[in-house]
Interface confidence: low
């Protein structure tokens, strides 16, 4: 549903967007996922703050936890035990890292309505969560794990060597928060909450990068963080496990780590429990190209885990690294030994394999020149998963249901004809033995949540339509977009072009290339969205496009892999083939192209802005990498290798953005990071400056002091400003 | 209950062409990757072609690579297969069936029965 | 291509007799084997799949065992209604291939 376009006399009612509406928000969307907690019933919390359960089946809902006690310790969030006789409210919410953040907790008895005094939790705390059935609590405080039988128990501490900067328990360290985990917690409990597994990572012999953050004191601070970049020492990583019923009879035991792993240096990636007596864990080599899954099995008489070698899983990837950015994890089936994971065919295509004994002998699921994205859910009868199989467009998302419990083990599409303008990229989320579904729909259309049965499919209610959203865009003259590819030498470029609402295909525009390009990533996607870039089509008349090219995901392995062990080279090519083709349609105004990005995009931008085209007249390049031997050693060395002479040293090196200084010569370059960002360092835009100036070549800067990687707050405000100025000074466009 | 149905067949002489359709009914044909398979009289099973769901992915036995094109139609529940430059070899009665995803072909329409000769 | 090798190629046995054929394949198919029952003049029907899993409404005297590159296919009482030529075929991987079957005649 994108509002529809009034033409002739009411046009004249109608505006263009403004950079404010963009700064203000005024045009973002809501979506509603449920907190699930049972089969048929959620959590979810109200307009006016209340925690209110729903049951479906009976159509009623309660409040299980006023406003008023949530406003009471300043709570921004909460967590009901399974047992449903406690809720933990989270308070004092302190950002660290991208997911990682420390907060206060109070545990409220839903029984008496008054918070549990005595034996309270310690402050900050980096973690905390139920166990999945019952009130049993887990939680990270100073680097090391506690465990509380009930809320006002005392509490049990099951490690003791945590050490900030040193020694991470129950909580990853930097790098694999960001690069591997993704999450802020490394501990996982067993399905009944009879034993606890948990991660240490060792950072005792990582380097560390240090950098000032100013802040209003005389003195600036110095961070610290261990951060193993390309080819350094990384962390040491150990998975134990302990039995919370018994915490003190044997404690945590060692988990063994696979043979053909331990022999050289390697990762954990994950752990998945399958019931409370057999554990799956994932190790990685350092060279990323080779992944175990082991299936390991407690022994009673011995009180340790078994791994035997018979329950090890090896996927490798011969032509690229394993998996897409992450390896999948696997979702196991009723029978506790056999699953279903996403990995490589034959073909090339990452697709839905199950996998009974071995992986030789994997039975495939899905198939097709298409790609499975995620499996969501496995019951007795159904897998439902997310693919972007249907009418072949790579940047949309539909949720299907295979049968697996009967023959003819059929599939359906639940989404793709469910509202096909408005809605054709979706994620969804299921209740308890998927008897409910809601399905979130991201456009490209204005998004729409709504709730589903888990047997029939059929629409129960809408949950959030965005009418308030819609409502607003009635009289906006949004951009018109259009996504499409190109076939350049046996290679498709999906690409989505965002134009001027009159656009005239008679008439020349200026173009604006916006490129993220890193490895697995995917730009062209059929959501909705109200943003910078909608803004400078709709007010200042250019056209924007965004292109998908080699190294990108979900379109086949040979895309993907392309990139591998020379990152900077095809993603470059790519985007100034599609400006070619794009000057070719014969409405981009040829003396008027510009390139942006941020992150991997602006290392991007900034290797097409030196690539000595003569295509760019000017770009942007926010907190680019400028050489990937400052970048993280997870990230970097899964798609380049090692720095070495012996491995791909001189890829390293050719790959920089300091190489090309020279190339910058005859473009207009704005240079923009924040100077307290953890994850591409300020370092990659200093070394750039370095270079630009030692071969005196004039450039724009602008840094942003003691912001991170996402430039957020008033930063925000301020950058997009003056990326807006310089734009328009650029394509003559007066301001 | 699921039905196909193929038409189509008959005489043709060698280096001539043919198109065989299959009607479809029963099931939800846009949700399902079909397939051709050949029958020489008196011989076994050939498979010949397979096209996916959404028509966008084909595949072929490499005796008819280059000469047939499997093709199909959602909205007519109905598949095809364009027989170009015939030979005597392709004298056959083609069955049309239905796939599931990645497993066997579990239902078969009657056949046509395809004649090459000069 | 993977060869899909059926044998034996025909075979007489008596009502009430157990009866055996085994399909062996050049390659490791896993378990991506189906078994198809054609009758004179009629279309083949699909009896197992996944090596081992009947079809709907398929009797349970049909049975089918192996995986990776042996499979077996099993009529555990001979009926005069199974006279019919059986095929093996593999969807492991294209091309889809299939055994050269195996005629069933009642003695």
């Known amino acids: 549903l994108r509002p529809s376009r009034v033409h002739n006399s009411e046009e004249n009612t109608m505006r263009a967007l403004t950079l404010k509406d963009i700064l203000n928000g005024t045009f973002s969307y809501k979506t509603f996922f449920p907190n699930w907690i049972s089969g048929q019933e959620y959590l979810h919390q109200s307009a006016d703050n209340n925690i209110v359960l729903y049951n479906i089946e009976t159509g009623q809902s309660y409040t299980i936890l006023s406003n008023r006690t949530m406003k009471s310790v300043n709570a921004s969030n909460y967590g009901l035990s399974p047992d449903r006789q406690f809720v933990y409210l989270e308070s004092d919410y302190s950002k660290l890292w991208r997911y990682s953040y420390t907060a206060t907790y109070y545990i409220y008895d839903l029984s008496n309505g008054e918070f549990v005094r005595g034996n309270e939790l310690p402050r900050p705390i980096q973690y905390l969560c139920w166990s999945p059935v019952g009130s049993k609590l887990a939680y990270v405080y100073q680097n090391n794990i506690y465990l509380k039988q009930r809320p006002g128990d005392p509490p049990f501490q099951i490690t003791f060597n945590g050490r900030e900067n040193k020694i991470f328990n129950g909580i990853p360290d930097w790098v694999y928060e960001e690069e591997m985990l993704a999450t802020k917690y490394a501990l996982w409990w067993s399905p009944n909450g009879k034993f606890l597994a948990y991660a240490e990572f060792n950072d005792t012999d990582i380097p560390v990068i240090a950098y000032s953050y100013y802040g209003d004191e005389q003195y600036p601070r110095t961070i610290n963080i261990p951060y193993p970049k390309a080819g350094a020492k990384n962390p040491v990583v150990r998975i134990f496990i302990i039995d919370t019923t018994y915490p003190a009879y044997v404690g945590p035991q060692e988990v063994p780590v696979p043979a053909m792993i331990a022999s050289s240096d390697y990762y954990f990636s994950w752990l998945t429990w399958v019931t409370d007596e057999r554990v799956c864990l994932q190790w990685l080599k350092r060279v990323q190209n080779v992944s175990v899954l082991s299936i390991c099995d407690f022994r009673e008489d011995w009180q340790t885990w078994d791994c035997p070698k018979t329950q090890e899983h090896i996927e490798e990837s011969r032509t690229g690294w394993a998996g897409g950015f992450f390896v999948s994890t696997p979702v196991f089936s009723y029978d506790a030994i056999s699953y279903y994971k996403i990995f490589s065919d034959k073909d090339g295509y990452k697709h839905i394999h199950y996998i009974k004994d071995t992986v030789e002998n994997a039975i495939q699921i899905t198939s097709g020149k298409w790609e499975a994205i995620n499996i969501f859910r496995v019951t007795q009868d159904s897998l439902f998963y997310s693919s972007n199989e249907f009418e072949e467009y790579p940047g949309r998302r539909n949720i299907y249901r295979i049968s697996i419990g009967s023959y003819p083990p059929s599939k359906k599409c639940v989404t793709c004809h469910l509202r096909k303008e408005r809605c054709q990229y979706y994620t969804a989320s299921f209740s308890d033995y998927a008897k409910y579904y809601a399905l979130v729909c991201y456009g490209p259309g204005i998004p729409i949540s709504t709730l589903h049965d888990g047997r029939t499919d059929q629409e129960i209610k809408i949950l959030e339509e965005n009418k308030e959203l819609e409502n607003a865009l009635k009289n906006i003259q949004l951009p018109k977009e259009e996504i499409k590819k190109l076939e350049v030498d046996e290679i498709t470029l999906w690409y989505k072009m965002i134009l001027p609402p009159q656009f005239d295909r008679s008439k020349k525009y200026p173009l604006l290339i916006q490129v993220y390009g890193g490895p697995c990533s995917q730009s062209v996607r059929s959501v909705f969205a109200v943003n910078w870039i909608s803004y400078l089509a709709s007010k200042e008349g250019m056209v924007i496009a965004l292109v998908d090219g080699r190294g990108t995901a979900f379109q086949g392995d040979k895309l993907l892999y392309a990139v591998y062990r020379k990152l900077g080279v095809y993603e470059v090519e790519d985007q100034i083939t599609a400006v070619r083709k794009f000057i070719e349609m014969g409405f981009i105004d040829e003396k008027r192209i510009a390139i942006w990005g941020w992150s991997y995009g602006g290392y991007v931008s900034s290797l097409a802005l030196a690539s000595g085209t003569g295509l760019f007249k000017c770009g942007i390049a926010v907190a680019p990498v400028s050489s990937w031997e400052y970048y993280a050693s997870v990230y970097t060395e899964r798609f380049m290798g090692l720095p070495t002479k012996d491995d791909n040293l001189e890829h390293y090196k050719n790959s920089t953005v300091m190489a090309r200084a020279e190339y910058f010569r005859n473009v207009d370059y704005l240079l923009i990071h924040g100077t307290a960002d953890d994850n591409v360092h300020f370092q990659n835009s200093a070394q750039i400056a370095k270079a630009l100036v030692n071969a005196q070549v004039d450039f724009q800067a602008m840094w942003y002091s003691d912001q991170n990687h996402g430039l957020s707050g008033l930063s925000t405000n301020h950058l997009y400003t003056h990326m807006t100025h310089f734009l328009k000074q650029c394509f003559s466009l007066s301001d | 209950d699921v039905q196909l149905v193929e038409s189509g067949g008959g005489l043709v002489k060698p280096g001539g062409s043919l198109r065989l359709s299959c009607t479809v009914s029963?099931?939800?044909?846009?949700?399902?990757?079909m397939s051709w398979v050949r029958q020489a009289p008196g011989k076994g099973l050939e498979w010949v072609s397979t096209?996916?769901?959404?028509?966008?992915?084909?595949y072929y036995a490499d005796s008819v690579k280059g000469r047939f094109t499997i093709s199909r139609d959602n909205a007519k529940n109905s598949l095809y297969l364009q027989m170009n430059s015939l030979r005597a070899e392709d004298t056959a009665v083609y069955y049309c069936?239905?796939?599931?995803?990645?497993?066997?072909?579990?239902?078969w329409g009657q056949g046509t029965l395809v004649t090459v000769s000069s | 291509d993977i060869q899909m090798t059926q044998s034996p190629s025909s075979l007489s046995a008596s009502v009430g007799d157990r009866v055996t054929i085994t399909c062996k394949a050049s390659?490791?198919?896993?378990?991506?084997v189906a078994w198809y029952q054609q009758k004179p003049g009629k279309a083949p029907k699909l009896l197992i799949y996944?090596?081992?899993t009947r079809h709907t409404g398929v009797p349970s005297r049909f049975s089918g065992s192996g995986s990776g590159t042996d499979f077996t296919f099993t009529i555990s009482s001979l009926q005069p209604e199974d006279i019919a030529t059986y095929y093996c075929?593999?969807?492991?991987?294209?091309?889809?291939?299939f055994g050269q079957g195996t005629k069933l005649e009642i003695k």
């Open positions: 069936t239905r796939d599931q995803v990645g497993y066997a072909m579990d239902y």
């Open positions: 096209i996916s769901s959404g028509g966008s992915y084909t």
């Open positions: 996944w090596a081992s």
């Open positions: 075929q593999q969807y492991s991987r294209y091309p889809y291939t």
């Open positions: 029963g099931f939800t044909f846009s949700s399902y990757t």
């Open positions: 390659q490791d198919v896993g378990i991506a």
